[in-house]
Amino acid sequence: GGGGSKHKCFRNSLENNETLESIMNTLESEEDFRKYFYYLEGSK
């Protein structure tokens, strides 16, 4: 039941002081990692 503030997409843009590495270090769920690598593919 319930969850959290759901993101429609992983990142529209990097937030202040965030790098791809710092985001990578915060990922928790399988879905987080999937969104992250999808984001990387789309930004190439």
């Epitope: 039941g1 319930g2 969850g3 959290g4 503030s5 759901k6 993101h7 990578m24 270090n25 915060t26 990922l27 928790e28 769920s29 399988e30 879905e31 987080d32 990692f33």
Partner: antibody, heavy 119, light 107 residues
Framework: QVQLVQSGGGVVQPGRSLRLSCAAS????????MHWVRQAPGKGLEWVAV????????HYSDSVKGRFTISRDDSKNTLYLQMNSLRAEDTAVYYC????????????WGQGTLVTVSS | DIQMTQSPSSLSASVGDRVTITCRAS??????LAWFQQKPGKAPKSLIY???SLQSGVPSKFSGSGSGTDFTLTISSLQPEDFATYYC?????????FGGGTKVEIK
């Protein structure tokens, strides 16, 4: 339904070790990050540690860094907290908690297990 | 680290009262704020996520609002089962941090 059943608490002397377990059921345990949160007697809640899907990322609070180790066994659907070099100030009820992912709120908690560090 | 300051630390209220608890973050956390209810000897229960979204199964007498640094939890009409301690928590960044709690007692 989702269940997080904890075990492993007890009384331990300062400097000794203890391992807590959190057995999960009712959801795809291996797909989610898991957390430990603690509460000293009569005090508020304090985040302790997190382990990600696959154990890729681990983070700890400054108060336990270097002494506690979070781990998981996805084949057993179980989360662990190995606590070494225990101190009196580690005395608390320890809770495991689940959330859907980074920047999601906790949705389920274990029942808690009391760790008492005393000589 | 992001500090979460909750107020008041305790309050006395009567059944039927409207109760408001506030939580302030030391820096902006967007809407990455949750509220929990805890009764003595029990695990916390998740009430609200995303500052204002009700967890599944939580009655609508609970509501949350706010964004950025200032947040509130409101109980529209206090019932006997609502006497408990309430905590806010930010989950914008590690380390995840909690407010100090607000104990709601019977007047």
């Amino acid at each position: 339904q989702v269940q997080l059943v904890q075990s492993g608490g007890g009384v331990v002397q300062p400097g000794r070790s203890l391992r807590l377990s959190c057995a999960a059921s009712g959801f795809s345990f291996s797909s989610f990050g898991m957390h430990w949160v603690r509460q000293a007697p009569g005090k508020g809640l304090e985040w302790v540690a997190v382990i990600s899907y696959g154990g890729i990322n681990k983070h700890y609070s400054d108060s336990v860094k270097g002494r506690f180790t979070i781990s998981r066994d996805d084949s057993k659907n179980t989360l662990y907290l190995q606590m070494n070099s225990l101190r009196a100030e580690d005395t608390a009820v320890y809770y495991c908690a689940k959330r859907e992912g980074y920047r999601y709120a906790y949705d389920y908690w274990g029942q808690g297990t009391l760790v008492t560090v005393s000589s | 680290d992001i500090q979460m300051t909750q107020s008041p630390s305790s309050l006395s209220a009567s059944v039927g009262d409207r109760v408001t608890i506030t939580c302030r973050a030391s820096q902006g956390i967007s809407n990455y704020l949750a509220w929990f209810q805890q009764k003595p000897g029990k695990a916390p229960k998740s009430l609200i996520y995303g500052a204002s979204s009700l967890q599944s199964g939580v009655p609508s007498k609970f509501s949350g609002s706010g964004s950025g640094t200032d947040f509130t939890l409101t109980i529209s009409s206090l019932q006997p089962e609502d006497f408990a301690t309430y905590y806010c928590q930010q989950y914008n960044s590690y380390p995840l941090t909690f407010g100090g709690g607000t104990k709601v007692e019977i007047k």
